[in-house]
């Protein structure tokens, strides 16, 4: 906190300009007044201010607008944005994408702070959905932004948002938030033909049911290892060996290097395992032939 | 986090010249502008003169023409080169960067200038 003191003569400051870095704390607190300032903030990310002269300009803003800053203000915070806590932030009505392009930009570069996360947070409530252009921006500036939305976050996202999302997007999302995009995706994706649906719904197949599995073993689709290996385990399961060979086509012989990891391991349990030697890869570990499986509510049963 | 380390302060007489280092290290990539401040003993640090990152330079009237601040990139070093130094310009003189999301400091050079 600065002391209140009276300015020394002469030194009123008329406009915000460059003059303003060479003033003391105590001068820019009995100098520079909140009105002028909020009217010229648009200057002040041009001026090399250190971040204790910015303390004293937010303590100025602060005063001047004590239940939070109006948009017009807000816009033109620059690195002042960087002074803000997320108590600030939570008083704020931010409604343009372009006031939080601006103040994303202040940030790039760097992990998501907690002031960012309070930005978007306070956004994407105001706008009651996260549409495709704020979309297409957060993923800008944050590639793992979608699979930091939890699943009931996520469900606030509609299917034509899902264009905006990059295959690395989706990196880090675990099964649960892929649970609640797939379906998005498929829904914005119908109307692609077979390989152009194939390119576009691949990163999201996570999520994919059995029934999805088998229509895309169907289609020619020649799925990677990589892929593979991220689908559900319950939604692999039931794929029958020739389905599981039409699914990956050439990357089959994948199936080797992967067998002691799910989800290899546990459909290869449950494959008879002359049919795992039809794939000619030496694959172990599937019911012995001339056995019976049944399935007793969930439980398997070895007879 | 940026680190930084001041050297070439020391005792000369009225008229002379003495040049600042400021050695930088670590996170460089973020800093936005450098200065030179100085401090008195019982006064509040004041800006002596700035450089930023695409080379501007800012001077504190009172030592307007006499002060230059100049970086060289290749070395990640700031200097500020003093003539016609004044028995005023006695202080501990600090480098500071400013950089994402907040101001580093040097631990400050002392320069005494006698008459």
């Known amino acids: 906190e600065v002391e209140k003191t009276a300015c020394p003569s002469g030194k009123k400051a008329r406009e915000i300009d460059e003059s303003l870095i060479f003033y003391k704390k105590w001068e820019l607190e009995a100098c520079v007044d909140a009105a002028l300032l909020a009217t010229q903030m648009d200057r002040v990310n041009a001026i090399p201010f250190t971040y204790e002269q910015l303390d004293v300009l937010k303590h100025k803003l602060d005063e001047l607008y004590p239940q939070g800053y109006p948009e017009s203000v807000i816009q033109h915070l620059g690195y002042l944005f960087l002074k803000m806590s997320p108590e600030d932030i939570r008083k704020w009505n931010v409604t343009s994408l372009e006031t939080l392009k601006a103040l994303l930009e202040v940030n790039k570069g760097h992990e998501m702070s907690p002031q960012v996360a309070t930005l978007i947070d306070r956004f994407v409530k105001g706008r009651g959905q996260l549409d495709k252009d704020t979309l297409d921006t957060l993923t800008a500036f944050y590639p793992g932004y979608l699979c930091s939305l939890s699943p009931e976050e996520l469900s606030s996202v509609p299917p034509s948002s899902i264009w905006a999302v990059r295959p690395q997007d989706l990196d880090t999302c675990d099964p649960r938030q892929l649970d609640v995009l797939y379906p998005k995706a498929r829904l914005a994706f119908q109307n692609m033909n077979g390989s152009e649906y194939f390119v576009k719904i691949q990163s999201f197949l996570g999520g994919a049911p059995t029934e999805d599995l088998k229509a895309l073993s169907q289609q020619n689709v020649s799925m990677d290892l990589a892929t593979f290996m991220k689908l559900r385990t319950d939604a692999v399961l039931p794929l029958t060996v020739a389905e599981v060979q039409k699914l990956l086509g050439p990357h089959v012989e994948g199936l080797k290097a992967e067998e002691r990891h799910r989800p290899v391991r546990d459909w290869i349990l449950r494959q008879r395992q002359d049919d795992l030697d039809t794939l000619g890869l030496g694959l172990q570990g599937g019911i012995p032939n001339g056995y019976l499986v049944l399935d007793l509510s969930m439980q398997e049963a070895l007879s | 986090e940026v680190q930084l380390v001041e050297s070439g302060g020391g005792l000369v007489q009225a008229g002379e010249s003495l040049r600042l280092s400021c050695a930088v290290s670590?996170?460089?990539?973020?800093?936005?502008?450098m200065g030179w401040h100085r401090q008195d003993p019982g006064k509040e640090r004041e800006l002596v003169a700035t450089?930023?990152?695409?080379?501007?330079?800012y001077y504190a009237n009172f030592v307007k023409g006499r002060f230059t601040i100049s970086r060289d990139n290749a070395k990640n070093t700031v200097y500020l080169q003093m003539n016609s130094l004044k028995p005023e310009d006695t202080g501990v003189y600090y480098c500071?960067?400013?950089?994402?999301?907040?101001?580093?400091w040097g631990q400050g050079t002392q320069v005494t200038v006698s008459s």
């Open positions: 500071r960067a400013t950089a994402h999301p907040t101001d580093y």
């Open positions: 670590g996170n460089i990539g973020s800093i936005r502008h």
């Open positions: 450089i930023t990152t695409v080379g501007t330079t």
